[in-house]
């Protein structure tokens, strides 16, 4: 009885209905189901289409711009559970721009295990106010159900029996009012007794076994469930998979050979993005979690001793990294079996991207070549690189080769970085911003001192355009307020004082004291530091009464730690000898101040003598919040309340808004227009700042979702057809 058909992979069905027939024998879709972009379909095309075997979707269901589809009641009459293991932008059910959809009609949908519902811009869609989503999912407040026909009160939804004056469907409470619950004019929403939790119940309200989810054909029997709360094994719902079975995809039990087959199928296929499944914690999962590596004899994940190695073998023994995309191919690698050539001329947010993709590399068996990488300022993105073996060398016996890098200023922060080069020499030519002191430091640290020959490190073309600071600037005065920091530092003058053009003050927010100068910098404009140019002070002839240069930093965030350093800006001297000075990075915290107001206050009266008040913490605490002050004041009763005739016709019952306790924009507009009609003279009140802000946030949220949807949905045509269950796109 449980899952009578097949387990099918996730599907993306678009353009026309031909692939929809692949759903015919599916009981479970292990993955997501997307049906979208069908502009030529008509209502009659869907008349005889039905997939009654489909019971469960493990990820999400997305319907987008499918023309002619008016209801899902025939298409998926028995869809009971959407598990939401992977979500589409936090949603397990998305119905978006379905221009002809009149009703959802998923009358057997009993449970959305994770995630919420987004039903938006469906201008024919009714029967939404008649669904009690709280009986289907937990996080109703995260549902986003707007801009449907239902919003305009044009629907006139009629539940079964209503036309004959009967109430056939269950009623549940909204805003103190009992409302009948139905999916269509002929299908009630099934509402089980609360004692049944989400396990479901029979038609007569007898609870299903607690291992069931959503529905069952008989009560109190784990073999008679329609879907399982935890795991499915041999026709029965079970709490966990007993040995020798493994948990798979969060819903079923599989044996070792099933997992092994998946592993080998992927290993032997050339398909990108497939997973070589492994076994960990009694689960058959796509890959070992971090800190574990696979034992190839039994597929078990075993803990790594120290960081886990991931050896990446390079085809033809070398790889050129010329973009973020090519760097992504080495993501997670810890050992490079081969040589790397870095040739990056431009890109967006480069330092961060390179660190994310190359930052785990600890060892390179061959050589490392940095060539014409105009975009690089530092090599600190190789955060963990500790060893270059030099087993294969660049022509001339070089294991580290840096040529023509116009903006390279730092190799690594040698006070924090160790690098050993086992064999081979260093080569440095035409790196105009890289000081020789930096290169010599590398020779010492890497153990290559004495290996280089005379022309391996060019004295004239390295650091020739740099301010190679050799003096330390010290801060002499620091004062803080909640939004300002006043700094002074010791004066610095080069041998020819006219060479000092000024100082550059660098600062940024730094929650942790682990910042280095070149973090987040590249030569393409990305710089996580804010830079202030400061003129030199007036020069006094008396060395004892020198003015200390300084700067008042304004507009800072309260109770925030900043990293700060200052360096000189000096002219380039003809003798190819540039002086300069730079401070260490210091950390200064601004003072605390008043917090911003607490957010989203909600008050509810739960009895005649109590009011419950809830709020969220302020967005800007501006310090450690120790307590809140609550003020209240008794208000005089509104005399209108006593004078109003409550039997007046035209008084409407309150209707539920989608995310209590706040009213949606649409219901506010509706209420205003009603008021205008009755009052005649009145105009609507101007919107408050908070209303305007809320509307801006709402529209920004809508745009973000639409952008996400379009990015995921509109993909270039593939030459091969079909997408597998492991389609990595949304999660």
């Amino acid at each position: 009885h449980l899952y009578p058909g097949e387990v099918c992979p996730g599907m993306d069905i678009r353009n026309n209905l031909t692939r929809l027939h692949e759903l015919e024998n599916c009981s479970v879709i292990e993955g997501h189901l997307q049906i979208l972009l069908m502009f030529k379909t008509r209502p009659e095309d869907f008349r005889d289409l039905s997939f009654p075997k489909l019971i469960m979707i493990t990820d999400y269901l997305l319907l987008f711009r499918v023309y002619g589809l008016e209801s899902l009641k025939d298409l998926f009459p028995n869809l009971t559970v959407i598990r939401g293991s992977r979500l589409f932008f936090n949603y397990a059910l998305v119905i978006f721009e379905m221009v002809h959809l009149k009703e959802l009609g998923l009358y057997n949908l009993m449970n959305i295990t994770r995630g919420s519902v987004r039903i938006e811009k469906n201008n024919e869609l009714c029967y939404l106010a008649t669904i009690d989503w709280s009986r289907i999912l937990d996080s109703v407040e995260d549902n986003y159900i707007v801009l449907n026909k239902d919003d305009n009160e044009e629907c006139g939804d009629i539940c079964p029996g209503t036309a004959k004056g009967k109430t056939n469907c269950p009623a549940t409470v909204i805003n103190g009012q009992f409302v009948e619950r139905c999916w269509t004019h002929s299908h009630c929403q099934k509402v089980c007794p609360t004692i049944c939790k989400s396990h479901g119940c029979t038609a007569e309200g007898l609870c299903c076994h607690s291992e069931c989810l959503g529905n069952c054909s008989q009560p109190d029997d784990p073999t008679k469930c329609v879907a399982c709360r935890n795991f499915y094994l041999d026709g029965r719902c079970v709490e966990t998979c007993p040995p020798p079975y493994y948990h798979f995809q969060d819903w079923r039990c599989v044996n070792f050979s099933f997992c092994q087959d998946l592993h080998h199928k992927c290993k032997n296929s050339r398909r990108q993005g497939c997973h070589q499944y492994v076994i960990h914690n009694n689960k058959c999962i796509p890959e070992c979690p971090s800190g574990y590596t696979m034992n190839s004899s039994n597929l078990l994940c075993t803990p790594c001793l120290g960081p886990c190695p991931k050896v990446c073998h390079l085809l033809e023994g070398e790889k050129t990294i010329d973009s973020v995309t090519s760097a992504q191919e080495l993501r997670g690698c810890t050992v490079i079996n081969g040589s790397l050539i870095i040739n990056i001329r431009g890109g967006n947010n480069l330092a961060a991207e390179l660190e994310a993709n190359l930052g785990l590399i600890e060892e390179i068996s061959g050589y490392l070549k940095i060539r014409r990488s105009y975009a690089l300022v530092s090599l600190s993105f190789f955060r963990k690189l500790r060893l270059i073996r030099g087993e294969t060398l660049e022509i001339g016996n070089y294991s580290f080769y840096a040529l023509d890098n116009q903006n390279l200023r730092q190799l690594w922060d040698w006070s924090k970085h160790n690098l050993t080069i086992t064999q081979g020499k260093l080569f440095f030519h035409y790196n105009p911003k890289l000081c020789l002191s930096e290169i010599h430091k590398m020779e010492e640290v890497s153990g290559t001192k004495g290996r280089q020959e005379r022309n391996d490190i060019a004295l004239k073309t390295n650091g020739d355009q740099a301010s190679c600071e050799n003096e330390l600037l010290k801060f002499s005065y620091i004062r803080t307020s909640f939004d300002k920091i006043l700094l002074r530092w010791e004066p610095y003058w080069p041998p020819d004082f006219r060479d000092l053009l000024g100082f550059m003050l660098f600062y940024k927010e730094a929650p942790y004291q682990n910042v280095t100068e070149f973090d987040g910098q590249d030569a393409c404009g990305s710089n996580s530091w804010t830079v202030v140019d400061i003129d030199p002070p007036l020069r006094s002839n008396d060395p004892k009464s020198q003015n200390h240069p300084g700067w008042l930093m304004r507009g800072l965030k309260p109770w925030t730690q900043y990293a700060i350093f200052v360096k000189t800006l000096v002219t380039f001297s003809d003798e190819r000898r540039t002086y300069g000075a730079k401070s260490d990075i210091i950390y200064v915290q601004t003072d605390a101040t008043n917090p911003s107001v607490p957010l989203d206050p909600i008050s509810v009266s739960n009895s005649s003598s109590q009011i419950i008040l809830k709020w969220k913490p302020p967005s800007d605490p501006n310090g450690n919040i120790t307590h809140y002050l609550v003020f209240w004041e008794r208000q005089a009763e509104d005399s209108e309340l006593f004078e109003l005739d409550y039997c007046l016709k035209g008084l409407k019952l309150p209707s539920r808004t989608w995310s209590p306790p706040f009213e949606s924009e649409d219901s506010q507009k509706h209420n205003q227009s009603e008021y205008e009609d009755s009052a005649g003279e009145c105009c609507s009140c101007p919107k408050t700042d908070s209303q305007i802000l809320k509307e801006l946030e709402e529209s920004s949220f809508r745009k973000t979702f639409e952008d996400y949807l379009h990015n995921v949905v509109f993909v270039p045509r593939k030459t091969s057809s079909g997408t597998g269950a492991e389609d990595p796109r949304p999660s």
């Epitope: 269950p170 007794p193 038609a203 007898l206 609870c207 076994h209 607690s210 291992e211 029997d221 709490e239």
Partner: antibody, heavy 115, light 106 residues
């Protein structure tokens, strides 16, 4: 044939504790939710507690929450009700009943809370 | 909490006659109501669940009906063994019993 036999009732002082047991037979005990229901001296029936088949889900009415604990041992086919901080209004005949619709009941065990 | 108001609290009828007991819920209970017969010294016995569904082995003299908040239970062709106290139970939102109706034979 379904059989439920309660035991453990007796006389107890206010503030005292008592543990009731219910032995089940004639059905697959581990498949069924079980409940305790009591009948007061005024002949009113009151639901006391319910526990799901596997023991993961438990519900109580407000008047016993925090004082009574329902539990089960599926290996022994036994249902239990641990009662503490007893009050005089807890005096009643206590029945164990099967499943969420109380389709089968035992004969009951009498609990008297009195000084 | 849902309250169940059962009436009458007692009634007397003749053998072969018909009796009707009503239960009114304080809110909608979606037909989730059951009826029990209780005789002294025994545990209660389930007669009807889901408003009108007879338990296996229960004679068709027993019947139930209702919807929304109002429900009724009837016994026709009264027999001597029907002397008992009858209770309604709502199980829509947790459980609440009615106050009971004691049935006697005239």
């Amino acid at each position: 044939e379904v059989q439920l036999v309660e035991s453990g009732g007796g006389l107890v002082k206010p503030g005292g504790s008592l543990k009731l047991s219910c032995a089940a037979s004639g059905f697959t005990f581990s498949n069924y939710a079980m409940s305790w229901v009591r009948q007061t001296p005024e002949k009113r029936l009151e639901w006391v507690a319910t526990i799901s088949d596997g023991g993961h889900y438990i519900d109580y009415p407000d008047n016993v929450k925090g004082r009574f604990t329902i539990s089960r041992d599926n290996a022994k086919n036994n249902l239990y009700l641990q009662m503490s901080h007893l009050r005089s209004e807890d005096s009643a005949m206590y029945y164990c009943a099967r499943a969420t619709n109380f389709a089968y009941w035992g004969q009951g065990t009498l609990v008297t809370v009195s000084a | 909490d849902i309250q169940m108001t059962q009436s009458p609290s007692s009634l007397s009828a003749s053998l072969g006659g018909k009796v009707t007991i009503t239960c009114k819920a304080s809110q909608h209970i979606n037909k989730y109501i059951a009826w029990y017969q209780h005789k002294p010294g025994k545990g209660p016995r389930l007669l009807i669940h889901y408003t009108s569904t007879l338990q296996p082995g229960i004679p068709s003299r027993f019947s139930g009906s209702g919807s929304g908040r109002d429900y009724s239970f009837s016994i026709s062709n009264l027999e001597p063994e029907d002397i008992a106290t009858y209770y309604c139970l709502q199980y829509d939102n947790l459980y609440t019993f009615g106050g009971g109706t004691k049935l006697e034979i005239k």
